[in-house]
């Protein structure tokens, strides 16, 4: 009778094992082991027992002990089971961003590992088991479908293999794949709302606002604002599930014409875009030209108004004849025209909008000086000791200097409240003088003495 010890062995791949072959007869003609494995016999006293070291065990094997005894030949097998953990445990790659509501298929591939009967594949979300299946096939593949929810955002999905050798007196060997972190997002089907001026004047600034509601996670949304080739630098304000991106846009003469304003929102692997056209125009204020801004009374003055070639102008409310970018009027300057405003209003149509520009110029008419009876009476008769205010107003532009002197040296206090005395009596020569010339007027002050009865 041939026996083998141990009859069953579980050992790690590439490991070694000592196998003892024994026979029941004392003098066997033959005692040995049959195996493809590298073997080394260990010398022992006696003839009925032999010990072999089998090495580099790579796969399951059944070495066989045999013996030839006088009563016949017999054999005994030992069962070597090789165990090893998988060489590859991998989740099939997936885009990290997944839209909420999508069915996401997780696929785990396992290469190698034995014994397969003891090898299980587990799919997990965090620590929660989603699916558990034995490893079948090479490579073994386990799949599960997950409906992506908002609360899955940031969750880690992984695949774990479990080689359970505890029934064989060994331990549970676990291998885990690299985790796949899921980023969930919601990008609504509605395009972003874009608020901007439809027309924008050269060398001015406009404000562009792009906004969108119903985003998740809003902080991860990227906003791209551009006017033509000019990237805008918005200030983004976030709400719970919304954002508002505000940018200042400056345009120059080079941008003149129709430009495309774009707002693109990128979240995950999706984007939404809104396009709008902005017309950039140049429209300088009309020019009001006076032949001279300052003229003397009686001078002929031409007032011209010139504007953008496509504009239509009105000068002091009167439209140009024919309607167009130029208007003019002629006048003879009078004192009443001093300080008169000449206003030119120009209107230009840009992208269906009417743009208005105004320019005003003031005419200065130099006239005078004037001293007349109404404003500078020639005769005053006042009671002695009464309080009086001598009034004499000179007119002209520029406003004349006025002085009233008696005998060329004694002043009359114009506009002052004076006590009337005999000294005040007399004839005063009032002289109004300006750059336009001078005029004089005689003013007589009579003082009435109190009558004593």
């Amino acid at each position: 009778q041939t026996s083998v010890s141990p009859s069953k062995v579980i050992l790690p791949r590439g490991g070694s094992v000592l196998v003892t072959c024994s026979t029941s007869c004392d003098q066997p003609k033959l005692l040995g082991i049959e195996t493809p494995l590298p073997k080394k016999e260990l010398l022992l006293p006696g003839n009925n027992r032999k010990v072999y070291e089998l090495s580099n065990v790579q796969e399951d094997s059944q070495p066989m002990c045999y013996s030839n005894c006088p009563d016949g030949q017999s054999t005994a097998k030992t069962f070597l089971t090789v165990y090893w953990t998988p060489e590859r445990v991998e989740l099939a790659p997936l885009p990290s961003w997944q839209p909420v509501g999508k069915n996401l298929t997780l696929r785990c591939q396992v290469e190698g590992g034995a014994p397969r009967a003891n090898l299980t594949v587990v799919l997990l979300r965090g620590e929660k088991e989603l699916k558990r299946e034995p490893a079948v096939g090479e490579p073994a593949e386990v799949t599960t479908t997950v409906l992506v929810r908002r609360d899955h955002h940031g969750a880690n999905f992984s695949c774990r293999t479990e080689l359970d050798l505890r029934p064989q007196g060994l331990e549970l060997f676990e291998n885990t794949s690299a985790p796949y972190q899921l980023q969930t997002f919601v990008l609504p089907a509605t395009p972003p709302q874009l608020v901007s001026p439809r027309v924008l004047e050269v060398d001015t600034q406009g404000t562009v606002v792009c906004s969108l509601d119903g985003l998740f996670p809003v902080s991860e949304a990227q906003v791209h604002l551009a006017l033509g080739d000019q990237r805008l630098n918005p200030t983004v304000t976030y709400g719970n599930d919304s954002f508002s991106a505000k940018a200042s846009v400056s345009v120059t003469a080079e941008d003149e014409g129709t430009q495309r304003l774009t707002c693109a929102v990128i979240l995950g692997n999706q984007s939404q875009e809104t396009l709008q056209t902005v017309t950039i125009y140049s429209f300088p204020a009309p020019n009001v030209i006076l032949t001279k801004p300052e003229v003397s009374e009686g001078t002929e003055v031409t007032v011209k108004c010139e504007a953008h070639p496509r504009a239509k102008v009105t000068l002091n409310g009167v439209p140009a004849q024919p309607l167009g970018p130029r208007a003019q009027l002629l006048l003879k300057a009078t004192p009443e025209d001093n300080g008169r405003s000449f206003s030119c209003s120009a209107t230009l149509e840009v992208a269906g909008q009417l743009i208005h520009k105004n320019q005003t110029r003031e005419l200065r008419v130099l006239y005078g000086p004037r001293l007349d009876e109404r404003d500078c009476p020639g005769n005053w008769t006042w009671p002695e000791n009464s309080q009086q205010t001598p009034m004499c107003q000179a007119w002209g532009n520029p406003l004349p200097e006025l002085k009233c002197l008696k005998d060329g040296t004694f002043p009359l206090p114009i506009g002052e409240s004076v006590t009337v005395t005999r000294d005040l009596e007399g004839t005063y020569l009032c002289r109004a003088r300006s750059t336009q010339g001078e005029v004089t007027r005689k003013v007589t002050v009579n003082v009435l003495s109190p009558r004593y009865e």
Epitope: L405, K406, G408, T409, F410, P413, D423
Partner: antibody
């Protein structure tokens, strides 16, 4: 504006000082006479207006007479006393004037009253 | 009568200092007041008219103010050349030219 006629005069005599003007018309300017006795302040004697009307300090009435021609203004001193020893100035536009920034003064002429 | 009273009679000021001279009229002369500078052996120099207006060529360190009966002449940043006697003169009434000038203020610059 330039004064002349000053010098030594005996008390009780008569002295006429003359102010000669050029560059302006006396018909449109008043002229005045001011004096300053040694160690004393300025004091007005009198003024002749552009209309030839005269105005005198109360102490000068009767002893001083102002008159004018087209280019001169005279100050006649009758019966001077030693108190009248002073420098006599002729001034254009003594009070106010149409030409604000100017008051023309002569260099003055010294009158010494002594026996 | 329009009597003009000037104070102080004499004042001392250091170079660069400020001096203030007051002039009071016995009754209102409105703004009709002139200021003169008088140095020995020289004709009076016209400084200010209408109480506050600088005569032609007068430096801005001279400043006049006031109206009615109270007037002031201020010399800021006094210079040695400002040593002189200063007179105010009423330039209003023809009725009395007695005491048209103030008594004068002697300014000594040290």
């Amino acid at each position: 504006v330039e004064e002349s006629g000053g010098g030594l005069v005996k008390p009780g005599g008569t002295l006429t000082l003359t102010c000669t003007v050029s560059g302006f018309s006396l018909s449109s300017h008043a002229m005045g006479w001011v004096r300053q006795a040694p160690g004393k302040g300025l004091e007005y004697i009198g003024i002749i207006g552009s209309s030839d009307r005269t105005y005198y300090a109360s102490w000068a009435k009767g002893r001083f007479t102002i008159s004018k021609t087209s280019t001169t203004v005279d100050l006649k001193i009758t019966s001077p006393t030693t108190e009248d020893t002073a420098t006599y100035f002729c001034v254009r536009d003594p009070y106010d004037s149409y030409d604000d920034g100017y008051r023309l003064w002569g260099p003055g002429t010294l009158v010494t009253v002594s026996s | 009568a329009y009597d003009m009273t000037q104070t102080p009679a004499s004042v001392e000021v250091a170079v660069g200092g400020t001096v203030t001279i007051k002039c009071q009229a016995s009754q209102s002369i409105y703004r009709y007041l002139s200021w003169y500078q008088k140095k020995p052996g020289q004709r009076p120099k016209f400084l200010i008219y209408d109480a506050s207006k600088l005569a032609s060529g007068v430096p801005s360190r001279f400043e006049g103010s006031g109206s009615g009966t109270e007037f002031t002449l201020t010399i800021s940043g006094a210079q040695s050349d400002d040593a002189a006697t200063y007179y105010c003169q009423q330039a209003y009434s023809s009725g009395s030219i007695d005491n048209a000038f103030g008594g004068g203020t002697e300014v000594v610059v040290k």
